[in-house]
């Protein structure tokens, strides 16, 4: 029987290799192989300061796989020098390119600075480097630009240790002075560049219509057309203040809807430091300013000021316990100032203004009191002006400012009122200043 032998066929298949990949400039390829066939892959890594880009679009990683038709599944990316782009603008400041004009690539250096005199840099020294991650970064590691904070407590006034019984203010003497119209005439003091500190009673009637408050800064004459206009974004009245029931917690903050430009006529007042009490002892001199009633019984045309000494708290409490002022309304949240002989005082229309003191260590003025209340007859002998004691409210002020933001939104929408109310009934016989 014949033997049968069949065909023996051996199939061998050689996968078509992919084109040999060339790493882009400033990049390297891994793994390096003699050839790359089906399902082989490679990755591209860029040198420090260079980033993977596919066109304009960034990639964190790149890997290509060899396909069965002998082509790579994606094109080679580039390794481009990291470009941090133009640095953010600095409000009230500027940026200088140190490495070279408009150079924004890896290791480039820029220097932020604030407008001299009226602003100071907060957070860091203003030097930023373009790092490999593509962010402008300070020596402390911050990616956000610094902040130019207004310098507070600057005054043109030559400090006199030597408004009712007062003198005329000159330009730049009280650059924190704010005139508040809309209800009755009142005052306030600028904090930072978009907050006004005032008395709760001064704006209470407008609390639900904050946008009606006509807020004027940089004015010297009450009726002058030369001033900077501001509007309220929100009003914050102390939750412990009860209108027409005593004057405890007579403090409020107004957030402006835009930051104001600081200059020699518009500068914020400083808040008191912890050590400030040492400049507000009995007989220390504070200065109150305003457009309130003068000795002639009329609202002042020109901004007036008066230098008045702090009065011993017990003496002040006693003065207001005598008829017709009985009621013991002077609390630990208040301080008193004035002359026992009378003649120098704040008065109606000065409400909400600042009683300021010079910090002898920093040579800056700070707000120690807010004009609140006093006897019916301003400057009366044996009676004193009563002021909200600001140092007691530093946590309240800082809490509101941090929670409700430093920057005015400048956006639309109606101004709002924020407060928590605890009503208590109590009679009083004193007038609001």
């Amino acid at each position: 029987m014949a033997s049968m032998t069949g065909w023996k066929i051996h199939y061998t298949s050689t996968a078509q290799p992919c084109p040999y990949p060339m790493a882009p400039p400033n990049g390297h390829l891994s793994p390096v192989q003699a050839k790359y066939i089906l399902k082989d892959s490679f990755s591209i890594f860029c040198e420090p300061g260079y980033e993977l880009l596919q066109g304009h679009l960034p990639l964190k990683s790149f890997a290509a796989v060899c396909q069965k038709d002998g082509s790579w599944d994606q094109p080679m990316p580039s390794c481009s020098i990291v470009d941090c782009g133009p640095p953010d603008d600095l409000p009230s400041g500027r940026v200088e390119y140190i490495t070279g004009p408009e150079v924004t690539t890896y290791k480039a250096v820029i220097q932020y600075s604030c407008e001299e005199t009226f602003y100071t840099m907060k957070v860091n020294d203003g030097k930023y480097v373009c790092e490999a991650d593509g962010f402008w970064t300070s020596s402390k590691g911050e990616r956000s630009p610094p902040v130019c904070e207004p310098v507070c407590g600057l005054s043109a006034r030559t400090t006199g240790g030597r408004i009712y019984g007062g003198q005329k203010a000159k330009p730049g003497d009280f650059p924190w002075q704010v005139l508040i119209l809309g209800g009755s005439t009142a005052a306030g003091a600028l904090l930072y560049d978009n907050w006004v500190l005032t008395a709760a009673h001064a704006i209470y009637e407008q609390k639900h219509d904050a946008s009606s408050l006509d807020i004027r800064l940089g004015a010297l004459k009450r009726l002058s057309p030369h001033y900077t206009q501001a509007w309220a974004e929100a009003v914050f009245i102390h939750e412990g203040y009860t209108h027409d029931a005593g004057f405890d917690n007579d403090i409020a903050l107004i957030k402006l809807n835009n930051k104001v430009v600081i200059n020699s006529n518009i500068t914020p007042i400083c808040l008191p430091r912890k050590e400030a009490e040492s400049f507000m002892r009995t007989d220390d001199i504070g200065t109150a300013s305003g457009w309130g009633l003068t000795q002639r019984g009329l609202l002042a045309r020109n901004l007036m000021y008066v230098d008045i000494p702090i009065v011993d708290h017990q003496k002040c409490t006693a003065a207001y316990e005598k008829p017709p002022y009985s009621g013991g309304s002077v609390t630990a949240n208040m301080l008193c100032a004035g002359l026992e002989s009378g003649g120098k005082d704040s008065c109606r229309g000065d409400s909400g203004g600042a009683l300021v003191f010079l910090d002898n260590e920093t040579q800056r003025w700070f707000v120690g009191g807010i004009v609140s209340w006093g006897s019916m007859n301003c400057g009366e002998a044996g009676q004193y002006g009563v002021y909200t004691k600001v140092i007691n409210y530093i946590p309240w002020i800082k809490n509101i400012i941090s929670n409700f933001g430093g920057g005015g939104s400048g956006g639309g929408g109606s101004a709002k009122f924020v407060a928590a109310w605890t009503l208590k009934a109590a009679a009083h016989h004193h007038h609001h200043h």
């Epitope: 066109g55 679009l57 991650d133």
Partner: antibody, heavy 114, light 107 residues
Framework: QVQLQESGPGLVKPSQTLSLTCTVS?????????WNWIRQPPGKGLEWIGY???????SYNPSLKSRVTISRDTSKNQFSLKLSSVTAADTAVYYC???????WGQGTLVTVSS | DIQMTQSPSSLSASVGDRVTITCKAS??????VAWFQQKPGKAPKPLIY???YRYSGVPSRFSGSGSGTDFTLTISSLQPEDFATYFC?????????FGGGTKVEIK
Amino acid sequence: QVQLQESGPGLVKPSQTLSLTCTVSGYSITSDYAWNWIRQPPGKGLEWIGYISYSGRTSYNPSLKSRVTISRDTSKNQFSLKLSSVTAADTAVYYCARYWGDYWGQGTLVTVSS
Amino acid sequence: DIQMTQSPSSLSASVGDRVTITCKASQNVGSNVAWFQQKPGKAPKPLIYSASYRYSGVPSRFSGSGSGTDFTLTISSLQPEDFATYFCHQYNTYPLTFGGGTKVEIK
């Protein structure tokens, strides 16, 4: 499967700020790529608004740069668009998209009208 | 900004036809061009990236070519589901830009 979903108000008043959020599922926005916003006015072509990259860097169309902010919330795997001072010309379908467009959201129509 | 000029702006074709759409960039964009298909009321659907790379799941009748300033999208045999508007897109240079679109209609 990578999915993107836009959300936000469909009607915005002139001069106000348009705010939209893109929620990404199936991929972490910090893992890689650029996460874009693109818009298309009714009956018109596509316009790139800007992106936020995996590292948090942003790039904006210069024609809109002064009004645009793109940010992200990595804990929610979302990125957001804010466009301020809107006018009727900002009425469009707004899309979010990954990279140069391999994945897109379905789009959301935003009308600017009083 | 780089202008991406698409032509034609619209065309009429029949099922089975070979359709070619071109896109001209106002300056060199390398091969950083993508093509999208969009149907009314829908988001754009990606077809091609890096001028000639097809996204997975995209039928092989769609192909892209070109580099530098001249790019082409070809549909080798038009299917009923291909009637739509097609956009080119350059992602080479900031700001990213799109072509004005080509509407492919049934003849």
